[in-house]
């Protein structure tokens, strides 16, 4: 590290003095200091001498000596005060530019350290500082306004108390620039626009920034539109607004509109699409299949997407039967708006009961007319089974009836012993009935099938079981012949709790 002689942090000299600052290093050394007049520099091997033979208040400042060849980059510094009774301040710059929230150094250097106790910072013409101005002072560097704000862009003076009177520095203009985080913020409304030919339309493009220096324009299909600009300032932001008013739209007005704003940080743009139509429209659609199957006791949401212009004048869900004349509860229907022209309507059907199977229709109306979308809801049921013994054409026959949806399959089992349900170990014979007779098959109802098993003689120590199953579940009925006749064992009753 180089050494400055004298090796003290500060020197105080009188105006007119000859000042010599000597810096000694291991290798060559260099001086750096404030821009001030009349310094001469001469080198003598590993030392360098900075000299002036007529020191003035303007020589007040910090002088630093560095050793360029030093890998550690060491330096030594000394601060020179040229104590001028008429000039307590040496102002190094008359304009200071910082960004908001940076510290702003106003470089008025005190020429006499003894005056430090009586210094203050004021605005020009003796005006006090703005409230909440947080500042500190260093006799070497000047006043620092901490975390400067845009509103503190003012002209300042440094004041020192000399012999009971305040002596001011020349003024320093502080410019605090807004920090521009990026291109201006943009809004383009509406985000989408539909109009019938001949109607009026309005498109508003607005941009805002903390700094006034930005441009904004609206373009239609890459053509810049000439629109008068409105400017405003609120919430500490500058706003520029372009409003496009169309009294009677036509097809040539349709297309893509872009709102573009730019500043030194770059460009932002946002777009919308304007559609011009010949007449009102109303389109209903669903992402769901219009034919729905749900297991009894479960829930279902029916969803309809509506695309319409002008807006809907009315809409409702209707139950079209066939079971009852009940209508969906309004509280189970809700509407959500995706955007101006698209809506989703949902009907919630929780814990479906048998009487709620059937057709549900969504109806909507706008000036373009009525539209409807109908869902068909079929409920699925597990099979219910019953077996009776009868004679058909003189032959003993077991008759099994199974009812459920989808249509059940039927299997007969014969097993040894008397049991409520045949297990694998007891099974003597199995018959699959691939084509049971369909007794009833109405829309939205259960399908009832019948299967016949002709038995020449009933074995008394055996059980005959009819089993039915479908995609929902299965059911069975065990038939046990006894000497006094036949005895049937239905399964545990099928319980349904909607």
């Amino acid at each position: 590290i180089p050494v400055i002689e004298p090796s003290v942090p500060e020197l105080v000299v009188k105006p007119g003095a000859t000042v010599t600052l000597r810096c000694v290093g291991n290798g060559s050394v260099e001086w750096d200091g404030p821009p001030s007049p009349h310094w001469t520099l001469y080198s003598d091997g590993s030392s360098s001498i900075l000299s002036t033979n007529n020191a003035t208040f303007q020589n007040t400042g910090t002088y630093r000596c560095t050793e360029p060849g030093d890998p550690l980059g060491g330096s030594a510094a000394i601060h020179l005060y040229v104590k001028d009774p008429a000039r307590p301040w040496n102002v190094l710059a008359q304009e200071v530019v910082v960004f908001e929230d940076q510290d702003a150094l106003l470089p008025c250097l005190l020429t006499d350290p003894v005056l430090e106790a009586g210094v203050s910072l004021v605005r020009v013409r003796g005006r006090p500082l703005m409230r909440h101005t947080n500042y500190s002072f260093s006799p070497w560097h000047g006043f620092t306004i901490h975390r400067a704000k845009f509103i503190q862009s003012q002209d300042y003076q440094c004041s020192a108390l000399m012999g009971g009177r305040k002596v001011m520095s020349i003024s320093i203009r502080l410019k605090v620039q807004k920090v521009i985080p990026g291109p201006p913020a943009l809004t383009l409304v509406p985000a989408e626009l539909v109009r019938i030919r001949g109607e009026a339309a309005q498109i508003v493009c607005s941009a805002s920034s903390v700094d006034v220096n930005f441009d904004v324009f609206l373009q239609h299909n890459n053509t810049k539109l000439a629109i008068p600009q409105q400017s405003d300032f609120h919430n500490n932001r500058y706003q520029k607004v372009l409003t496009l008013n169309l009294d009677q739209v036509d097809f040539q007005h349709a297309g893509n509109y872009s709102c573009v704003a730019s500043n030194v940080q770059g460009k932002h743009s946002t777009s919308m699409f304007f559609r011009v139509v010949e007449s009102a429209y109303l389109n209903l659609s669903s992402e769901q299949n219009l034919i729905q199957e749900v297991t009894v006791g479960e829930g279902l949401n029916l969803k309809v997407m509506v695309e319409a212009y002008p807006g809907l004048q009315g809409f409702n869900w209707t139950y079209l039967g066939p079971f009852s004349d009940h209508q969906p509860e309004p509280k189970l229907a809700n509407a959500t708006t995706k955007d101006t022209y698209r809506h989703t309507f949902t009907l919630s059907l929780p814990r479906l009961k048998p009487s709620e199977a059937g057709r549900y229709s969504f109806l909507a109306r706008n000036p373009g007319g009525w539209r409807a979308l109908t869902f068909e809801l079929t409920l699925r049921y597990p099979p219910e089974v019953s077996v009776i013994w009868t004679f058909i054409n003189g032959s003993g026959t077991l008759l099994c009836a199974a009812s459920g949806y989808p249509q059940p399959n039927v299997t007969w089992l014969q097993c040894s012993g008397h049991t409520d349900r045949c297990d694998e170990a007891q099974v003597l014979q199995v018959w699959d009935d691939p084509y049971p007779e369909v007794l009833s098959q109405e829309p939205f109802h259960k399908v009832t099938v019948q299967s016949l098993l002709t038995v020449e003689t009933l074995e008394h120590n055996q059980t005959y079981e009819c089993r039915a199953h479908n995609s929902v579940g299965s059911g069975s009925w065990a038939f046990i012949p006894i000497s006094a006749g036949a005895h049937t064992h239905p399964p545990d009753e099928f319980l349904f709790t909607p």
């Epitope: 004298p6 090796s7 020197l11 000859t18 350290p113 430090e116 070497w140």
Partner: antibody, heavy 121, light 109 residues
Framework: QITLKESGPTLVKPTQTLTLTCTFS??????????VGWIRQPPGKALEWLAL???????RYSPSLKSRLTITKDTSKNQVVLTMTNMDPVDTATYYC?????????????WGQGTLVSVSS | DIVMTQSPDSLAVSLGERATINCKSS????????????LAWYQQKPGQPPKLLIY???TRESGVPDRFSGSGSGTDFTLTISSLQAEDVAVYYC?????????FGQGTK
């Protein structure tokens, strides 16, 4: 009034690092024109300046000991800390911290009582 | 480094007599720009820290009796005790702070 007090170990082993703390009152090391230095005095011998730190964090070291010394300040605690590495029996001395300021021409105008540090295995 | 040499190493003076201690620097400690000599004198009594007596070679520190005075310029300096008192028995050191490292004389007892 200004007072300074040194603290640290009284005995260190050779090759160890010595850490000395100077705790002061009556002035602030954030006030311009103020410094705190360290000076040592082997038993029966003369004074030797070691290091110095100023209000603006400018640090000065004796060139012959620079590689072994580090001086730091904690303005909020009113403390200056000196560390000296690779201690040797010849470093046995009374270590003083002292105040200096612009007013008294940068001489050491207030001294602590000193702390005797012995270096021995 | 600037070498500070004090003479004599030891001095015996009767109470009430003048005592003179010399200090010589190996190079000038006078800074011509402000006409200041960067030299100080300290007094150290047994078991105590040094005490500042004189700075700028001739400016007496506040609270120091006026029997102590400093003089000299450039490379040759003198500390004078005009009328020695019993409490003045001590070791006296000169110190230069013109060029780093700051150096002390070997002391005069």
């Amino acid at each position: 009034q200004i007072t300074l007090k040194e603290s640290g170990p009284t005995l260190v082993k050779p090759t160890q690092t010595l850490t000395l703390t100077c705790t002061f009152s009556g002035f602030s090391l954030s006030t311009s024109g103020v410094g705190v230095g360290w000076i040592r005095q082997p038993p029966g011998k003369a004074l030797e300046w070691l290091a110095l730190i100023y209000w603006n964090d400018d640090k000065r070291y004796s060139p012959s000991l620079k590689s072994r010394l580090t001086i730091t300040k904690d303005t909020s605690k009113n403390q200056v800390v000196l560390t000296m590495t690779n201690m040797d029996p010849v470093d046995t001395a009374t270590y003083y911290c002292a105040h200096q300021e612009r007013r008294s021409g940068w001489s050491f105008d207030y001294w602590g009582q000193g702390t005797l540090v012995s270096v021995s295995s | 480094d600037i070498v500070m040499t004090q003479s004599p190493d030891s001095l015996a003076v009767s109470l009430g007599e003048r005592a003179t201690i010399n200090c010589k620097s190996s190079q000038s400690v006078l800074y011509s720009s402000n006409n200041k000599n960067y030299l100080a004198w300290y007094q150290q009594k047994p078991g105590q820290p040094p005490k500042l007596l004189i700075y700028w070679a001739s400016t007496r520190e506040s609270g120091v009796p006026d029997r102590f005075s400093g003089s000299g310029s450039g490379t040759d300096f003198t500390l004078t005790i005009s009328s020695l008192q019993a409490e003045d028995v001590a070791v006296y050191y000169c110190q230069q702070y013109y060029s780093s490292p700051w150096t002390f004389g070997q002391g005069t007892k």
